[in-house]
Amino acid sequence: KIDACKRGDVTVKPSHVILLGSTVNITCSLKPRQGCFHYSRRNKLILYKFDRRINFHHGHSLNSQVTGLPLGTTLFVCKLACINSDEIQICGAEIFVGVAPEQPQNLSCIQKGEQGTVACTWERGRDTHLYTEYTLQLSGPKNLTWQKQCKDIYCDYLDFGINLTPESPESNFTAKVTAVNSLGSSSSLPSTFTFLDIVRPLPPWDIRIKFQKASVSRCTLYWRDEGLVLLNRLRYRPSNSRLWNMVNVTKAKGRHDLLDLKPFTEYEFQISSKLHLYKGSWSDWSESLRAQTPEEEPTGMLDVWYMKRHIDYSRQQISLFWKNLSVSEARGKILHYQVTLQELTGGKAMTQNITGHTSWTTVIPRTGNWAVAVSAANSKGSSLPTRINIMNLCEAGLLAPRQVSANSEGMDNILVTWQPPRKDPSAVQEYVVEWRELHPGGDTQVPLNWLRSRPYNVSALISENIKSYICYEIRVYALSGDQGGCSSILGNSKHKAPLSGPHINAITEEKGSILISWNSIPVQEQMGCLLHYRIYWKERDSNSQPQLCEIPYRVSQNSHPINSLQPRVTYVLWMTALTAAGESSHGNEREFCLQGKAN
């Protein structure tokens, strides 16, 4: 009932609680002398469903048959309307539409840990939309019975608060849950179990790991468990992996040796427990233990490459480069690299430890046969040395790869292709493709990149350290024993017209012709590999088309003669540069008048 209902009543038949799909009769009746003044035909009773009018009747009572009410609660309010006055609330009623409870399904009970209490869960089935009471009953040996009630609107869990003990682990217990509301009741099927069936051990705790003699091959995992635990399962994985390794162990008594861990790797370990081989359930996984395995000496060998540079008639500069070992090969933190340089005939050797770099440069005599060995060292030892005989990598012309080309291949990739050398191609033991950013000054500090390719390959995709709009000097070496041949080409992954033209810095006269000198375009404005320079000239104040001279681009060239200018005529000159994508804007303009005699 809503409000005090002093002026009248609202009655609901058959009940305020009805089954979905049922019809209800709602009657609103005025109490004596509570209608409008004068006579009862003036009474207009109005029925509201929530805040909207749905029916009316003139007189002392209103009768409304209502069907099709939705699940849940619907509020009906009756009001009286008299002529020339506001509506007056008479009374109201809530009608609760729902369904009888379905049979609870999948009743299951567990006790968390040997000291825990028995708690059961079940599936309620579809929502009744009504107040529904659940009663959980547990019966055990010697006619012992426990009962617990739950009055939550969404009840699907109850804890008995009792502890089953392992004194008689095979004794049977039976649980049943009953749901009751105004429209009916229903009971689950009984669930029968023993102590061993329902006790779920607590997850193992106090997990530790020990490496005997700091070795990854002698590793033991330790943990603590509840007293009755018979089985454990262990799972472990490298911290950066999603896949677990799984091990099942019986009667482990809180320890297990692990034999397949990788060195210098952070692992995550978890353990779960069970009381019986085929009864009961596994505990939750323990909290994770994270631990790093010890280092082992590196495996594998460094990939080493080198560059030779002529200094003078007696000396040469050797620059060695090597790539880091992979994590699985390094098997620890690389502390230093050991480089040994040896003259093979005289047996002189020098050894140096390099830290923080993967390159080393030294100057050696141009005479003698030289070899280097490079190895990587961690706290446990060194990798096998990589040995290289220093030779003239481009000396054997017949070993030079032919028809080398470099083409853009998608974003920041260059596809390098070649043909085998003329000399017996089967003599090639491997190809090395080397690339570095092109710097006009031939800067030796520019990082060097390389990759090795099998002798039957005639192409390589280079993608490491490749940037758009940068020109790379690419060399392909064919190596055979202690001989090498090479070919080079310029290439870029992406290009556009240069952003500026060359800056003419001087024009000088030499025997009736002129020599133009210019500054190179800054690398960041070249926008790829330059193909040509163009020198333009025309008579000052003339509207005629300029003449031009196109010069193939060479890295070191920065001057060019022109001999087609007329004496005592003032010319305006400027330059542009071209990539495969197009021509730059003008560089600066310079005026020049050739002083030579007229013919």
Epitope: F56, S64, Q65, G68
Partner: nanobody, 123 residues
Framework: QVQLVESGGGLVQPGGSLRLSCAAS????????MSWVRQAPGKGLEWVSA????????SYADSVKGQFTISRDNAKNTLYLQMNSLKPEDTAVYYC????????????????WGQGTQVTVSS
């Protein structure tokens, strides 16, 4: 979904009669009081008549009292309006709707409305 379909309108001479029908579907017709509302050209909505859910009580606007009769057949889910002695001022579009009250301003909800039927009274 709710559907109210009016019919029976047309052109009639002054003094003539028409009977409007409204076929209801998509809701429980017998739960609700129903109304006729009309809208004359260039004017606002005007409540005309109402009938309660079981047909035992009716109300009329003063302008049509004694001239129009509202009725319903819950078995056929149909509402009727019998219009006699029609006058030119009865020219309007007539709408069948769920009852919201007996004043023009009560009809702000448009969820239980038909598309209307045109009644034109002219000689």
């Amino acid at each position: 979904q709710v559907q109210l379909v009016e019919s029976g309108g047309g052109l009639v001479q002054p003094g003539g009669s028409l009977r409007l029908s409204c076929a209801a579907s998509g809701f429980t017709f017998s739960n609700y009081a129903m109304s006729w509302v009309r809208q004359a050209p260039g004017k606002g909505l005007e409540w005309v008549s109402a009938i309660n859910s079981d047909g035992t009580s009716t109300s009329y606007a003063d302008s049509v009292k004694g001239q129009f009769t509202i009725s319903r057949d819950n078995a056929k889910n149909t509402l009727y309006l019998q219009m006699n002695s029609l006058k030119p001022e009865d020219t309007a579009v007539y709408y069948c709707t769920k009852w919201e009250g007996d004043t023009d301003s009560d009809y702000k909800f448009k969820d239980y409305w038909g598309q209307g039927t045109q009644v034109t009274v002219s000689s």
